[in-house]
């Protein structure tokens, strides 16, 4: 019986470890600066790195600019978006800017899109200063179902900071759904 | 056999509980205001509390101003940095400020330092107002190896808000590395 | 013995799954816009949704405008607060605003209230622009005891953005206390 108990313990450790890892999807996606759209209106950002630098993904899928949930659960979602302008980049079309991020969830089954989180600020980026910068951070805890998609929309995408430490979003599973 | 099963269950509950606790390092470090450096360029903040007020640490080490990882894993890292100026605080030399935070990872094995997250804003703090305030929050999910170090760099450290609820950073382990 | 082992494994999977769920309280509360207080001073926000839209709660209690902890543990707490003003809403009393959030913990046993996190910014919302917006995000890792209460205080509540994606706070348990 002792040997059997040891075997139970052993198999359990493996099983617990394995199931724990399988139960914890995550992603951290960093902006792909080679493909940032232009314009000042709200646009969806579709180009992100998931496999270089700080970018990584596990038990989730990145496809067509969207982060796809493969496993039901409650997830913590976050985004950090940085905007910047230097006078050497040329004049801004306007000094009054609305710098915003929207983290949206799309359900394929019921074709609909909903904003989970938003953040940002109106800014006055005057010509008296040669450099301007602003960052937004949002985060929250959401129930996500397999097949649902997370995407990022921003205003003024041409002002995005292309560094991987500046503009990114991510998710990690915290717990199962009851 | 039933008694044995009960024993297995009992030992398992203990083992699961114990291993779960051991597997979840965390830290929440609050600014030590008695030792804030001066300067206007990016400086590293080395004085933090880990054992008073909201400051706490477990299965990680705080040494030489850096948060040291003791256990490989994926961690959620975060920082909240507040800057403020009151007309009684001193003679502010410029209205145009770049208030920034950089969360950096240093690998000892391969001596190199990389910025994981950055945030902040350029601000115009005019003399027309007697008080100014601004906070930055950043957060993200990163793979950290044992021995790696996390540190915080800021611009304009003399403007930091010294309250424990204002200027802090932290980390908690979410899952093992596969 | 093999049958017994299978039974052990089976009961263990159920037990582990069940105890894991029971051990992970969470809440995501979104602003109830029908009951936002007026004024420009610091006020406690007591009206939140916990059961509609993105609002949800499990193994925690929402009562009298406070999020009550039912289970000791280390929790990640977060808040996202958005302020906005459009010229059609009427003139602002002042163009110089202090837009702030305070996440506070109240202990019933020892009647005392402490600020865990604060964030925000002073803003100059000039009449030259027809629309103004600003968001704050804070987050941190804290030890919470059963019976303790989390509440949100803000300045200028009449400027709050009433959308569920804009103004919310939440918590999720990460680990037990040793």
């Amino acid at each position: 019986i002792r040997a059997e108990k040891a075997m139970v313990d052993g198999s359990w450790l493996d099983l617990a470890k394995r199931s724990k890892l399988e139960a914890q999807p995550f992603a951290h996606l960093t902006i792909n600066a080679t493909d940032i759209p232009s314009g000042s209106h709200k646009v969806s950002l579709s180009s992100w790195y998931h496999d270089r630098g700080w970018g990584k993904i596990s038990n989730m899928t990145f496809s067509n600019g969207k982060l796809i949930v493969n496993q039901d659960g409650f997830y913590y979602l976050y985004a950090n978006i940085c905007f910047r302008h230097h006078e050497t980049s040329g004049d801004l079309a306007t000094e009054y800017l609305q710098l915003m991020v929207y983290v949206t969830k799309t359900s394929i089954k019921i074709p609909s899109s909903h904003t989970l989180m938003k953040g940002g600020s109106t800014k006055y980026w005057s010509g008296n200063s040669e450099f301007h910068f602003y960052s937004i951070n949002v985060g929250g805890f959401f129930k996500l179902r397999s097949g649902e998609e997370i995407s990022i929309e921003v205003s003024n995408p041409s002002l995005l900071d292309p560094d991987q430490d500046a503009t990114y979003f991510g998710a990690f599973k915290v717990r199962d759904i009851d | 056999i039933r008694a044995e099963k009960a024993m297995v269950d009992g030992s398992w509950l203990d083992l699961a509980k114990r291993s779960k606790l051991e597997a979840q390092p965390f830290a929440h470090l609050t600014i030590n205001a008695t030792d804030i450096p001066s300067g206007s360029h990016k400086v590293s903040l080395s004085s933090w509390y880990h054992d008073r007020g909201w400051g706490k640490i477990s299965n990680m080490t705080f040494s030489n101003g850096k948060l040291i990882v003791n256990q490989d894993g994926f961690y959620y890292l975060y920082a909240n940095i507040c800057f403020r100026h009151h007309e009684t605080s001193g003679d502010l030399a410029t209205e145009y400020l770049q208030l920034m935070v950089y969360v950096t990872k240093t690998s000892i094995k391969i001596p190199s330092s990389h910025t994981l997250m950055k945030g902040g804003s350029t601000k115009y703090w005019s003399g027309n107002s007697e008080f100014h305030f601004y906070s930055i929050n950043v957060g993200g999910f990163f793979k950290l190896r044992s021995g790696e170090e996390i540190s915080i760099e800021v611009s304009n450290p003399s403007l930091l808000d010294p309250d424990q609820d204002a200027t802090y950073f932290g980390a908690f382990k979410v899952r093992d590395i596969d | 013995i093999r049958a017994e082992k299978a039974m052990v494994d089976g009961s263990w999977l159920d037990l582990a799954k069940r105890s894991k769920l029971e051990a992970q309280p969470f809440a995501h509360l979104t602003i109830n816009a029908t009951d936002i207080p007026s004024g420009s001073h610091k006020v406690s926000l007591s009206s939140w949704y916990h059961d509609r839209g993105w609002g949800k709660i499990s193994n925690m209690t929402f009562s009298n405008g406070k999020l009550i902890v039912n289970q000791d543990g280390f929790y990640y707490l977060y808040a996202n607060i958005c302020f906005r003003h459009h010229e059609t809403s009427g003139d602002l009393a002042t163009e110089y605003l202090q837009l702030m959030v305070y996440v506070t913990k109240t202990s019933i046993k020892i009647p005392s209230s402490h600020t865990l996190m604060k964030g925000g910014s002073t803003k100059y919302w000039s009449g030259n622009s027809e629309f103004h917006f600003y968001s704050i995000n804070v987050g941190g890792f804290f030890k919470l005891r059963s019976g303790e209460e989390i509440s949100i205080e803000v300045s200028n509540p009449s400027l709050l953005d009433p959308d569920q994606d804009a103004t919310y706070f939440g918590a999720f348990k990460v680990r037990d206390i040793d």
């Epitope: - | 001066s38 300067g39 001193g90 030399a93 410029t94 209205e95 003399g127 304009n156 003399s158 403007l159 | -």
Partner: antibody, heavy 122, light 107 residues
């Protein structure tokens, strides 16, 4: 070449007024806080006024507060010091000085003008 | 106001000598001290800031040290062109105050 050139000094009666100017060139004037520092006949250096880069903050020691006013015109790259209710102890060489970049609360001076002399007679 | 005291009004030295000038603050100024050189008939020139940082273009024979209330400015090997008055200034808190100056004379 970075240069500061003061003007406007001269002889003035006690209780009188005088306006000093400082023309800046060779650097982006609007990016720097500026000060006036005087040197007494005994060769002591005294800081008398400071102004932030954008001009919305002005600072003075108690000895001149209410009598001296520092201002700037960033469009014309010029610094001013309006002095009134002058006293004999205000007699000095007045230097225009650029505050070096550094901690936002700390002022030291990396570029000085050649100075202009102010003599207050009783 | 913080009072800065340079106890030696004059110091005499020879070319090639090492010379140290001291400055004392009436209260703790951490490391917020600058040193200036003023040659005869000229304006002051910044040499050292934040107690020990050499300003751009300043020869490395000029060094500064100290923290708190006691500060030292050193010329490791005096040159003839170093004939000047040397002033300390605290940049810790307003009003910004200067020492009375130390005149370095070459024998």
């Amino acid at each position: 070449e970075v240069q500061l050139v003061e003007s406007g000094g001269g002889l003035v009666k006690s209780g009188g007024s005088l306006k000093l100017s400082c023309a800046a060139s060779g650097f982006t004037f609007r990016n720097y806080a500026m000060s006036w520092v005087r040197q007494t006949p005994e060769k002591r250096l005294e800081w008398v006024a400071g102004i932030s880069s954008g001009g919305t903050y002005t600072y003075y020691p108690d000895t001149v507060k209410g009598r001296f006013t520092i201002s700037r015109d960033n469009a014309r790259n010029t610094l001013f010091l309006q002095m009134s209710s002058l006293r004999s102890e205000d007699t000095a060489m007045y230097y225009c000085a650029r505050r070096d970049y550094g901690d936002v609360y700390e002022w030291y001076f990396d570029v000085w003008g050649t100075g202009t002399t102010v003599t207050v007679s009783s | 106001d913080i009072v800065m005291t340079q106890s030696h009004k004059f110091m005499s030295t020879s070319v090639g000598d090492r010379v140290s000038i001291t400055c004392k603050a009436s209260q703790d100024v951490r490391t917020s001290i600058a040193w200036y050189q003023q040659k005869p008939g000229q304006s002051p020139n910044l040499l050292i800031y934040s107690a020990s940082y050499r300003y751009t273009g300043v020869p490395d024979r000029f060094t500064g040290s100290g923290s708190g209330t006691d500060f030292t400015f050193t010329i490791s090997s005096v040159q003839a062109e170093d004939l000047a008055v040397y002033y300390c200034q605290q940049h810790y808190s307003s009003p910004w105050t200067f020492g009375g100056g130390t005149k370095l004379e070459i024998k």
